[in-house]
Interface confidence: low
C-alpha cells in the first residue's frame, strides 16, 4: 500500500507540473480534476501546489490561478463567477465528460473560494478503505 501511495503521488506531481501544457493529452488532468471535484480538495498537499505551474502563476498584483475543479461552490456567492466561469466547466466534470481540449483554469479572486485542503489525505483514506 505504501508503494501504491508513492506511485500515486508521483503521478499526481507530474500531472500538476505538466497541467495545461499539452492540449492533446488531457486524460490525466481530467482524472485529477475529477478527484478534486469529488473529494472537495485542491492540490496534493495544499492549493498552493498549483502555483508552481508556470501557466497558473500570477505575478505581482495579478491573481494566481487554479484548475476550476478547486472551486468550492458553497463558498462562492458571486453569481457572475458561478454562472459564467465555474458552473459550465464543473458541469462537464460532473458528467465525467471527456470533451475538453484545453485545461479549465480559473483565477483565485479570494482564497476562501477554493478548497483549502490538499487531496493527499482524502486519497490515502480512500486507498486504505479499498
Amino acid at each position: 500500500r505504501a508503494q501504491l501511495e508513492r506511485s500515486l503521488r508521483d503521478v499526481v506531481e507530474k500531472t500538476i507540473q505538466k497541467y495545461g501544457t499539452n492540449p492533446e493529452e488531457t486524460a490525466a488532468e481530467e482524472s485529477w480534476d475529477y478527484v478534486q471535484f469529488q473529494l472537495r480538495c485542491c492540490g496534493w498537499h495544499y492549493p498552493q501546489d498549483w502555483f508552481q505551474v508556470l501557466i497558473l502563476r500570477g505575478n505581482g498584483s495579478e491573481a494566481h490561478r487554479v484548475p476550476c475543479s478547486c472551486y468550492n461552490l458553497s463558498a462562492t456567492n458571486d453569481s457572475t463567477i458561478l454562472d459564467k466561469v465555474i458552473l459550465p466547466q464543473l458541469s462537464r466534470l460532473g458528467h465525467l465528460a471527456r470533451s475538453r481540449h484545453s485545461a479549465d483554469i480559473c483565477a483565485v479572486p479570494a482564497e476562501s473560494h477554493i478548497y483549502r485542503e490538499g487531496c493527499a489525505q482524502g486519497l490515502q483514506k480512500w486507498l486504505h478503505n479499498n
Partner: antibody, heavy 116, light 107 residues
Framework: AVQLQQSGPELEKPGASVKISCKAS????????MNWVKQNNGKSLEWIGN????????TYNRKFKGKATLTVDKSSSTAYMQLKSLTSEDSAVYYC?????????WGQGTSVTVSS | DIQMTQSPASLSASVGETVTITCRTS??????LAWYQQKQGKSPQLLVS???TLAEGVPSRFSGSGSGTQFSLKISSLQPEDSGSYFC?????????FGGGTELEIK
C-alpha cells in the same frame, strides 16, 4: 506592501510562559497559513508549526507539541504563539512567516531569553 | 523526519565569480524545496520556491535547480550584497526541515 510586525524582546524566568504576537498587514490574513520558526544563535532554523487563520486549524512539528500553542485573532489580523514551561533551551529568536507553499514573507523576529 | 544535508558549510568567493550551493534530502521531496538568504541580524528572505521559481524581486543571477533529492542554488556574477547565510528548506511533509546553512563571504 506585505508586513509582519512582531512583538518586542522577552526576558523570562525558567518555568514561565510567554506569548509572542505577529500582526499582519498588506494582504488577506485568512488567505495564507502563518508559520513559526525558531532560530538558535543566528544559525540553525527549526519549523515549529503553522496555523490556517481561516479555519484555525494547526499543524505542529512533533518536537514542539506541548511546548508551543498557535492561535490567531482574525479581527485584528494577528497570529500568536505561546511557549510554556520555558527552559534555557527555549532561548532563541522566533519568527512568524506567511506561507504560500514556502514561506514568502517573514516578521523581523522576537528574541526570547530564559534566565533565572 | 526528512534530513537536509547542505554543502558547503561556508565558502569565500570574489565579486563576479559563480558559486553553487547544494542541498541533498534523505527522501524524495519532489519540487517542494525553497532557498532563503539571511543577512546578519535580519530575517530570512525567500529566494527560490518550488526548487526553481525565482521569488519576486530576486535578481536573475540567482537560479535554482533539481528535484527529488538533489538540489542546487547557483549565484552567478557575485555581488558584494550577496554575502550572508543561505538555507534550503523542504515543504513536502510534516515537519518541514531546513539545511544547516551555508555562510557565503565575498572577498
Amino acid at each position: 506592501a506585505v508586513q509582519l510586525q512582531q512583538s518586542g524582546p522577552e526576558l523570562e524566568k525558567p518555568g514561565a510562559s510567554v506569548k509572542i504576537s505577529c500582526k499582519a498587514s498588506g494582504y488577506s490574513f485568512t488567505g495564507y497559513n502563518m508559520n513559526w520558526v525558531k532560530q538558535n544563535n543566528g544559525k540553525s532554523l527549526e519549523w515549529i508549526g503553522n496555523i490556517d487563520p481561516y479555519y484555525g486549524g494547526t499543524t505542529y512539528n512533533r518536537k514542539f507539541k506541548g511546548k508551543a500553542t498557535l492561535t490567531v485573532d482574525k479581527s485584528s489580523s494577528t497570529a500568536y504563539m505561546q511557549l510554556k514551561s520555558l527552559t534555557s533551551e527555549d532561548s532563541a529568536v522566533y519568527y512568524c512567516a506567511r506561507s504560500v507553499g514556502p514561506m514568502d514573507y517573514w516578521g523581523q523576529g522576537t528574541s526570547v531569553t530564559v534566565s533565572s | 523526519d526528512i534530513q537536509m544535508t547542505q554543502s558547503p558549510a561556508s565558502l569565500s568567493a570574489s565579486v563576479g565569480e559563480t558559486v553553487t550551493i547544494t542541498c541533498r534530502t534523505s527522501e524524495n521531496v519532489y519540487s517542494y524545496l525553497a532557498w532563503y538568504q539571511q543577512k546578519q541580524g535580519k530575517s530570512p528572505q525567500l529566494l527560490v520556491s518550488f526548487a526553481k521559481t525565482l521569488a519576486e524581486g530576486v535578481p536573475s543571477r540567482f537560479s535554482g535547480s533539481g528535484s527529488g533529492t538533489q538540489f542546487s542554488l547557483k549565484i552567478s556574477s557575485l555581488q558584494p550584497e550577496d554575502s550572508g547565510s543561505y538555507f534550503c528548506q523542504h515543504h513536502s511533509d510534516n515537519p518541514w526541515t531546513f539545511g544547516g546553512g551555508t555562510e557565503l563571504e565575498i572577498k
